[in-house]
């Protein structure tokens, strides 16, 4: 039997076992987070599926994800939001230890989609496991990119108090205006709710003692934030390993000196 013709995209296809993975993650999340016990995971999956199934995968809108966003509504306490850019693993290691702080991936919708890829096809109910649109080579309005833009916007909009962001000091652009943080989250922090943004610049090299808070891209971030009437602070994290260790054991004598 000849397989039906399907569009070939430049990106990798939908993650294998995508529907079951989303359902399993949803169930696990609602079991671990009592405040989300009311969530019906089958409805969450139906809303997720509804956002991209049968739709042309280069024409997905934020509107498509609104039913899912509504089902996954969650609030983070003030001063407890941690944004990150190009340093996901450390940010997640941090919130795994500092359990009262939250990245987007610690929230239901971010947790469901973390590290997954998905797309459908126009006019069929099938999931495309062969290929999905690449953001650069194919289109930016693809199911995955639009999802992260949608939930990142919402995450930033609902943040309050002092918001923290972890930035990768090893990158040529420590603050990148084209990242999700730089293009979406920064512009959706609400000045009436957010008093300050505190950047933590994570150093890569062991002997790197430069003050990366003076980096031109950090100054650019400070300018954008200040213009939005939000105060800006910056800290160098010279030793990320020690930083995590001190979050785990704040009483450790070596943690009284700088990190």
């Amino acid at each position: 039997v000849l397989p039906r013709w399907r569009q070939q995209w430049s990106g990798s296809g939908t993650t294998s076992r995508f529907p079951e993975t989303v359902l399993a993650r949803c169930v696990k999340y609602t079991e671990v987070h009592p405040e989300m016990r009311h969530v019906d995971c089958q409805s969450v999956w139906d809303a997720f599926k509804g956002a991209f199934i049968s739709k042309y995968p280069c024409n997905i809108t934020e509107e498509d994800y609104q039913p899912l966003v509504k089902l996954g509504t969650q609030t983070v306490p003030c001063n407890k939001t941690l944004l990150w850019s190009r340093i996901k693993d450390l940010a997640h290691q941090f919130t795994q230890v500092q359990r009262d702080m939250f990245t987007l991936e610690d929230m239901l919708l971010g947790y469901l989609a973390d590290d997954l890829t998905w797309c459908g096809e126009f006019n069929t109910f099938e999931i495309n496991y062969q290929s999905c649109p690449d953001w650069r080579k194919d289109c930016s309005n693809n199911p995955v990119s639009v999802f992260w833009k949608t939930v990142s916007r919402r995450f930033a909009e609902t943040a309050c108090g002092v918001v923290h962001v972890m930035l990768n000091g090893s990158r040529s652009k420590i603050f990148d205006k084209n990242s999700t943080f730089g293009s979406v989250e920064v512009h959706n922090l609400q000045p009436e709710k957010v008093q300050a943004l505190e950047a933590w610049v994570i150093h890569g090299g062991r002997e790197d003692s430069r003050d990366l808070c003076q980096d031109p891209t950090i100054k650019e971030l400070e300018s954008i934030i200040s213009k939005r009437n939000i105060r800006f602070f910056c800290k160098n994290i010279y030793r990320p390993d020690k930083f995590l260790q001190c979050v785990k054991n704040p009483e450790d004598s070596s943690c009284l000196s700088g990190i």
Epitope: P3, R4, G13, S16, R17, P19, E20, L23, A24, V27, K28, C41, Q42, W45, F125, E126, I127, Y129, Q130
Partner: antibody, heavy 121, light 110 residues
Framework: EVQLLESGGGLVQPGGSLRLSCAAS????????MSWVRQAPGKGLEWVSE?????????YYADSVKGRFIISRDNSKNTLYLQMNSLRAEDTAVYYC?????????????WGQGTTVTVSS | QSVLTQPPSASGTPGQRVTISCSGS????????VSWYQQLPGTAPKLLIY???HRPSGVPDRFSGSKSGTSASLAISGLQSEDEADYYC???????????FGGGTKLTVL
């Protein structure tokens, strides 16, 4: 009525081949992940292989059959297949096909009656 | 040897409550969806519990499932003679990249 019906079992010599079929009816076959599960005489259930919904592009195998068995599906015929090559005595079992129901969080909610495969010289 | 460990046998008298355990790890029960199957002598298995603790329609409410961490269990209350069967837990295993069944538990109604 939702039904799965296996066929193709029989007696085969070690090293031989056999193709099992599982005919599905009463549901939209290509919407479902499908699985093969076997049960050796007097033993427990052992998962053998699984194929993704729609075009069946994702296939999974138990280590014990990897490289010897091939799962496939023909949605136009509503049929699931298991091509079994290089058969061994330890492949002797009743082979069941099962449907994984998304609405039941991928529990295997429909099973066939099974087809018996005997590998013996 | 299955990655999901079940006791080989369990027994109880009519009316009693029995529990069958299924022990695994983070790569299976810890992160995935657990289902339970009943296999009466000489018949194909039947889905008894899905999503750790949900019963398909037609399954008596005497059967209940639960999950905690990397273990799951099936409880049968008000035991009846027709419950005499083999019971299997099952889930996906991320390390094996395949599904796994427990070794099965033979339930005897005394």
């Amino acid at each position: 009525e939702v039904q799965l019906l296996e066929s193709g079992g029989g007696l085969v010599q070690p090293g031989g081949s056999l193709r099992l079929s599982c005919a599905a009816s009463g549901f939209t076959f290509d919407d479902y992940v499908m699985s093969w599960v076997r049960q050796a005489p007097g033993k427990g259930l052992e998962w053998v292989s699984e194929i993704s919904e729609s075009d069946g592009s994702n296939k999974y195998y138990a280590d014990s059959v990897k490289g010897r068995f091939i799962i496939s599906r023909d949605n136009s015929k509503n049929t699931l297949y298991l091509q079994m090559n290089s058969l061994r005595a330890e492949d002797t079992a009743v082979y069941y096909c099962a449907r994984l129901e998304p609405e039941k969080y991928y529990g295997m909610d429909v099973w066939g009656q099974g087809t018996t495969v005997t590998v013996s010289s | 040897q299955s990655v999901l460990t079940q006791p080989p046998s369990a027994s109880g008298t009519p009316g009693q409550r029995v529990t069958i355990s299924c022990s695994g790890s983070n790569s299976n029960i810890g992160n995935n969806l657990v289902s339970w199957y009943q296999q009466l002598p000489g018949t194909a298995p039947k889905l008894l519990i899905y999503r750790h603790d949900h019963r398909p329609s037609g399954v008596p409410d005497r059967f209940s499932g639960s999950k905690s961490g990397t273990s799951a269990s099936l409880a049968i209350s008000g035991l009846q003679s027709e419950d005499e069967a083999d019971y299997y837990c099952a889930t996906w295993d991320d390390s094996l990249n395949g599904r796994a069944f427990g070794g099965g538990t033979k339930l005897t109604v005394l």
